[in-house]
Interface confidence: medium
């Protein structure tokens, strides 16, 4: 069981792990799942230009401002 199993065992998340080092230019589409009934953490699923889907860390520097804008309507703080 991964880290999510202990913390989030009551809930169901899409992402079991995140992929590091993905270049933004490789991404064709981004889905952001806010905390909700299904999962107690923010999840980011990226569709890549090669057809694969991966999970990204919402804290990744190139994503952070985008995620904040989506979740907080432009608020700067996380």
């Amino acid at each position: 069981a991964g880290p999510a199993a202990a913390v989030l065992r009551e809930l169901r998340c899409v992402c079991l792990q995140t992929t590091q080092g993905v270049h933004p230019k490789m991404i064709s589409n981004l889905q952001v799942f806010a905390i909700g009934p299904q999962c107690s953490k923010v999840e980011v699923v990226a569709s890549l230009k090669n057809g694969k889907e991966i999970c990204l860390d919402p804290e990744a520097p190139f994503l952070k401002k985008v995620i904040q804008k989506i979740l907080d309507g432009g608020n700067k703080e996380n």
Partner: antibody
Framework: QVQLQQSGAELVRPGTSVTISCKAS????????IVWVKQRPGHGLEWIGD????????FYSENFKGKATLTADTSSSTAYMHLISLTSEDSAVYFC????????????WGQGSLVTVSA | DIKMTQSPSSMSASLGERVTITCQAS??????LSWYQQKPWKSPKTLIY???RLADGVPSRFSGSGSGQDYSLTISSLESDDTATYYC?????????FGAGTKLELK
């Protein structure tokens, strides 16, 4: 700017109940978890429970089941904690806090609400 | 419940000194460890989360390290504003549990 504004100090009698509020601003209330923490002198910090303010999910420490009830009013972006059957052991400062991007850490804290239980 | 053993319980250090506080979990918490600073009569302030990540607005002299059961918070060069009590928190398993705290004072 993220802010959590808690209600003021309360002096209450043993056996009664109290409700503490935590008004959130500066972010989308329903996108994060709100946690409640108890602090008594000499006892450090103790997790009471948390709730997903978008509705439906509330978790409690075994120590606070039957003692604390956590609710939220999304229309006013306010979280509440109701404590019942108060004793001197419940005299403490109670903090609310907002999660980061998941439940596992507390990014922003309220200023605390002092509850004193005394006859 | 997971027990967090924090040490030392209190310490004093000189300005500019390197300070390290440790927390040991009773079992593997997989880096679900955060650190908080609290000054008297104030609410806690988040310093570090996921064991190593610096929270927004926290000076770079603070850093976190560790994995598995053993974690530490380091202040690379102590400043007067750093006198406070420091707490670790594990959220690897419910319920989350705090360490007992480390009171840091200036020599």
């Amino acid at each position: 700017q993220v802010q959590l504004q808690q209600s003021g100090a309360e002096l209450v009698r043993p056996g009664t109940s109290v409700t503490i509020s935590c008004k959130a601003s500066g972010y989308t209330f329903t996108n994060y978890w709100i946690v409640w923490v108890k602090q008594r002198p000499g006892h450090g910090l103790e997790w009471i429970g948390d709730l997903y303010s978008g509705g439906g999910y509330t978790f409690y420490s075994e120590n606070f089941k039957g003692k604390a009830t956590l609710t939220a009013d999304t229309s006013s972006s306010t979280a509440y904690m109701h404590l019942i059957s108060l004793t001197s052991e419940d005299s403490a400062v109670y903090f609310c806090a907002r999660s980061g991007y998941d439940r596992t850490w507390f990014a922003h804290w309220g200023q605390g609400s002092l509850v004193t239980v005394s006859a | 419940d997971i027990k967090m053993t924090q040490s030392p319980s209190s310490m004093s250090a000189s300005l500019g000194e390197r300070v390290t506080i440790t927390c040991q979990a009773s079992q593997d918490i997989e880096s679900y460890l955060s650190w908080y600073q609290q000054k008297p009569w104030k609410s806690p302030k988040t310093l570090i989360y996921y064991a190593t990540r610096l929270a927004d607005g926290v000076p770079s002299r603070f850093s976190g390290s560790g994995s598995g059961q053993d974690y530490s918070l380091t202040i690379s060069s102590l400043e007067s504003d750093d006198t406070a009590t420091y707490y670790c928190l594990q959220h690897g398993e419910s319920p989350p549990t705090f360490g007992a705290g480390t009171k840091l004072e200036l020599k």
